[in-house]
Structures are given as structure tokens and as C-alpha cells.
Interface confidence: low
């Protein structure tokens, strides 16, 4: 009779993480009598995966009933596969011996490769807000995928970005891999509603990439522009001065009125109007009693936005002037049509 051969017909098996791997092994003869064992790896450091004779292997089941005397199929299934299970598995025939069974013949081995999906990409932006025209960095991370080949793309509002650097770790062989990418994004004043998207494509995702997003509203700070104007007199001795605070983001803003350098009133932006681009406008007004002033009055609108150093705009109120509308000679920009409706 021909000498027993241990046949592992599959050189490699590819299994998705979480699924069951079937490792096939057959023997050509029942002789010599003895058990089959499965190992991962070869040599003295090999790991026992299944022993037909004894032991408890909760994740392993046999394809056929190995208790039958005539059975020559020693295939096994390993359940709930993880990337850590990757490696080469050997089906090894032992011959009964005393005191221990003796290794008789090994199969050629089956390499188990595990396909594991990448984790959902996590996009994080800078710790502090930045203003338009500044370049900020976003990072994207995804972990636990296998095989190593992976594609990462960055988008801003659907437009692909090109200024980024990506690393996949580790460089050498591993059971699973991680990807880390840093993209540089130049902020514009219109970016309050913008999104940065990191898109990861991998063989396990079957053409449906994973996406992580970051809203630039968490990153951008659009500083306000100020305009102080004098409105028509409401009463013989009263002048209404308004401070238009335009195009700012986020909403956190505190305004202080100064009369000749002295604090007159402080208020926090509350009933703001939102522009289409996501920035805010706000208006504060100050009623000045002209009769209380002998000399000309310097009115200053001072704004502290989002914890930044205060910016201010001043208006000289001439006490001797006849009541009429006066424009500030330091006006920053024209009033938008949507502001005219306020009055």
C-alpha cells in the first residue's frame, strides 16, 4: 500500500473578518493509525489549533465526524475569524507512539489571509479656530483593516483635495493595518457651511467607501466688520448711533459702547440675523443725550469676538451740529440691503 499522504488542497484561503474559515485536509490512508493535529506556523514555536485526540478548542469544529474509523477527512472550520488568525496552517498526521505520539507527515500548509474592514474614518481638525486665508490641517485615521492596500481621498465640498500626506502602518507584514492622513485646507470667508470629507476605499467595502467628515464651522472664525453711523435725531436733544457688526462667525460676541473712552453699555449678541454663507450680522444702537455734553463726543463701538482681542470703530458726534443724518468717515463697507429693512 502506498505511504500515507496528507493533502491540503488549498494553498491559500481568504476569509472576511467575523466569518468562518474552512481549512481542508485529507489523508490517503488510515495507516499508520494515529490522530491528526492542526498547527499555525512551523517549527518549535508553532501554535496548536486543534488536536483530534484531546483538548478543548471552542472556535474549531470538524467538517466531518473524526470519531469514525474510516474517516480520512480532517478538514476544520475556525469560527469568528479575526486578523490575528492570519498565518499558515498545517495539518499534521501523528503515528501512535509510546509514551507520546510521533509526528509522521505534514501537509504543505494553507495560508489563511483575513480580510478585515477598516474602522469608520475619524476626522479631526485643529484645536483652535483659524481665520480665512489661513491654512489648517485635518487628520483622518482608520484602523484594523487587512489586506494593506487601501485608498484614501480628501474632499472639500465635493471637490477633491490634493495637498495631503498619507501613511499606512506598519510598513512590514502585519495581521492588520492603520492609515493616517493629514490634509491642508485653506480657509475662505464662505467656509462656515463647508465640510471636509475623508474617504477610505478598501477591498472589503465592495465599492462602498467609508467616509468621515468634519464641519469647518468647528474650525473657522470669521472676524466681524464694524460700521458706526449716526441716525436722525429722535428728539431735540437725542442722537441715535448704531453699530453694525457684519459677517462674523461663530456667534459668541460682546459689544461695548464707550463715550469719550468711558464704558456706557455692554451687551452680548442675541437676536442675530444669519447670512446665506452662515455668518451672522448684528446691530446695536446707542441713544446719546446731546444736552448732557458740552463738547464733542467720541463714540466708540468695541467688539470682542470669540475671545479674540477687541476691535473697535469710532464716530465723532458734534454737539453743535444741527440734527441731521451723518455718516461715519470710518465706515468699513456699505450697508447690505438686508440691513436697511431693520430700520
Amino acid at each position: 500500500e502506498e505511504e500515507l499522504q496528507v493533502i491540503q488542497p488549498d494553498k491559500s484561503v481568504l476569509v472576511a473578518a467575523g466569518e468562518t474559515a474552512t481549512l481542508r485536509c485529507t489523508a490517503t490512508s488510515l495507516i499508520p493509525v494515529g490522530p491528526i493535529q492542526w498547527f499555525r506556523g512551523a517549527g518549535p514555536g508553532r501554535e496548536l489549533i486543534y488536536n483530534q485526540k484531546e483538548g478543548h478548542f471552542p472556535r474549531v469544529t470538524t467538517v466531518s465526524d473524526l470519531t469514525k474509523r474510516n474517516n480520512m477527512d480532517f478538514s476544520i472550520r475556525i469560527g469568528n475569524i479575526t486578523p490575528a488568525d492570519a498565518g499558515t496552517y498545517y495539518c499534521v498526521k501523528f503515528r501512535k507512539g509510546s509514551p507520546d505520539d510521533v509526528e509522521f507527515k505534514s501537509g504543505a500548509g494553507t495560508e489563511l489571509s483575513v480580510r478585515a474592514k477598516p474602522s469608520a474614518p475619524v476626522v479631526s481638525g485643529p484645536a483652535a479656530r483659524a481665520t480665512p486665508q489661513h491654512t489648517v490641517s485635518f487628520t483622518c485615521e482608520s484602523h484594523g483593516f487587512s489586506p494593506r492596500d487601501i485608498t484614501l481621498k480628501w474632499f472639500k465640498n465635493g471637490n477633491e483635495l490634493s495637498d495631503f500626506q498619507t501613511n499606512v502602518d506598519p510598513v512590514g507584514e502585519s495581521v492588520s493595518y492603520s492609515i493616517h492622513s493629514t490634509a491642508k485646507v485653506v480657509l475662505t470667508r464662505e467656509d462656515v457651511h463647508s465640510q471636509v470629507i475623508c474617504e477610505v476605499a478598501h477591498v472589503t467595502l465592495q465599492g462602498d467607501p467609508l467616509r468621515g467628515t468634519a464641519n469647518l464651522s468647528e474650525t473657522i472664525r470669521v472676524p466681524p466688520t464694524l460700521e458706526v453711523t449716526q441716525q436722525p435725531v429722535r428728539a431735540e436733544n437725542q442722537v441715535n448711533v448704531t453699530c453694525q457688526v457684519r459677517k462674523f462667525y461663530p456667534q459668541r460676541l460682546q459689544l461695548t459702547w464707550l463715550e469719550n473712552g468711558n464704558v456706557s453699555r455692554t451687551e452680548t449678541a442675541s437676536t442675530v440675523t444669519e447670512n446665506k454663507d452662515g455668518t451672522y450680522n448684528w446691530m446695536s444702537w446707542l441713544l446719546v443725550n446731546v444736552s448732557a455734553h458740552r463738547d464733542d463726543v467720541k463714540l466708540t463701538c468695541q467688539v470682542e469676538h470669540d475671545g479674540q482681542p477687541a476691535v473697535s470703530k469710532s464716530h465723532d458726534l458734534k454737539v453743535s451740529a444741527h440734527p441731521k443724518e451723518q455718516g461715519s468717515n470710518t465706515a468699513a463697507e456699505n450697508t447690505g440691503s438686508n440691513e436697511r429693512n431693520i430700520y
Epitope: T22, V63, S64, D65, K68, N71, M72, D73
Partner: antibody
């Protein structure tokens, strides 16, 4: 469990037919499905098998390249597109559900009543 | 391709008697074998799988045995409704899935 075939009929050699099998009473998407045929007065001949999600299709040599098996799990329906039909394809075509516990074992625990296909000039 | 040979082609048995049907595989198919019953004008019905396991709702007068290349279907006491054609089928190696040629059990 119920399997109901339809779409059989009389065609000329070289023509096409599309068979359907409507499944009910079990979770269709969990099982491989097959077509098995039986020529008049003959035994059973396996024709084709499709895996649970439809990504694997297997055929007997006698129909390879001419027949296409497919499934729509959302409609619980199995199909067999038969092109370039020959006289030797004349048979009752049965739709059969896989009853095996393991994905590589194939036997059939439920069968439809069959639909007749006659190929004759 | 594994060939299944069923014998005899026809078996004449009296009601109440024992019927023994044979199925031989051209190579070892382990216990990967099923048996079906087909009555005239009807679809096949699964009787036995894994060589010796009865399918759901199959009476215990039907039993399967054997492994490797030699398999037997035994009907311990034939009832009138048991007269039919019986097919074996292996699933050791596929495609193709192959059936035996059938054994017709008729009333003696």
C-alpha cells in the same frame, strides 16, 4: 416551504426561454438554490446552482455557456435564462432548495412541482 | 467526475416486505450521500442525507447506511405509498452534483 416554477413551454431549437421560481415559507436569501431537470422517462440531472448572495454560479457541462442562473433575493425569486436551446434540453425543470448545513455540501430538501420545457422543430 | 451506480434497476417487492437498495460511488464520497423518492408525476422528496440521517417527517421504516463507496437504503416494511423510483446523490465533490440512475421499486 413552497417553490413554484413558471415560464416553461414549447420552443424551436436555438430559441430562448426564461424560467422563474417563486419561493415562500423560508428565508430565501439564506439558502443556495438549484435547478434540476428530468428528461422524459430518464433520471435526475443537476443543471445549475447559485450561492446565497448570487456571487457564485455553477453549471453542468451540458449547459455551460448557454444557461444563466440568477436570483433576486428582494423578490424571493430564482431564474434560469436558457439560450440556444437544443432538443436534448427537453425536460421537466425543477427548482430545488439546498438543505445542507455547510456551504460546500449540496442536497435538496424541498423541490417545486416542475415546469415542462419542450424543444422541438 | 464521481459516478453513482444504483442497483438493481428494478426491485419487485410485496407490501410488508423489506426492500434493500444499493448505491455505489466510483470513489470515496465519505458520508456525503443523500437519497430521494420520486413518485410518478411528482417532484422528488428528500429521504436521507449524510448517508444515514432521516430528513424531516420521514417515517423510521426508511434507513440509510454505508460510507465511502458503498451505500444502502433500506425500507423495513414496504407500504403501498412507498412504490416509487429512488435516487441517490453525492455531494462530496461538486460541480457537478451527480445522481444515480435510479431504482424502481414496484409491487410484486
Amino acid at each position: 416551504v413552497q417553490l413554484v416554477e413558471s415560464g416553461g413551454g414549447v420552443v424551436r431549437p436555438g430559441e430562448s426561454l426564461r424560467l422563474s421560481c417563486a419561493a415562500s415559507g423560508f428565508t430565501f436569501s439564506n439558502y443556495a438554490m438549484s435547478w434540476v431537470r428530468q428528461a422524459p422517462g430518464e433520471g435526475l440531472e443537476w443543471v445549475s446552482l447559485i450561492t446565497t448572495n448570487g456571487d457564485g454560479a455553477y453549471y453542468a457541462d451540458s449547459v455551460k455557456g448557454r444557461f444563466t442562473i440568477s436570483r433576486d433575493n428582494s423578490k424571493n425569486t430564482l431564474y434560469l435564462q436558457m439560450n440556444s436551446l437544443r432538443a436534448e434540453d427537453t425536460a421537466i425543470y425543477y427548482c430545488a432548495k439546498d438543505g445542507a448545513a455547510h456551504y460546500y455540501d449540496i442536497f435538496f430538501d424541498y423541490w417545486g412541482l416542475g415546469t415542462p420545457v419542450t424543444v422541438s422543430s | 467526475e464521481i459516478v453513482l451506480t444504483q442497483s438493481p434497476g428494478t426491485l419487485s417487492v410485496s407490501p410488508g416486505e423489506r426492500a434493500t437498495l444499493s448505491c455505489r460511488a466510483s470513489q470515496n464520497v465519505r458520508s456525503d450521500l443523500a437519497w430521494y423518492q420520486q413518485k410518478l408525476g411528482q417532484a422528488p422528496r428528500l429521504l436521507i442525507y449524510d448517508a444515514n440521517t432521516r430528513a424531516t417527517d420521514i417515517p423510521d421504516r426508511f434507513s440509510g447506511s454505508g460510507s465511502g463507496t458503498e451505500f444502502t437504503l433500506t425500507i423495513s416494511s414496504l407500504q403501498s405509498e412507498d412504490f416509487a423510483v429512488y435516487y441517490c446523490q453525492h455531494y462530496y465533490d461538486w460541480p457537478p452534483v451527480t445522481f444515480g440512475g435510479g431504482t424502481k421499486v414496484e409491487i410484486k
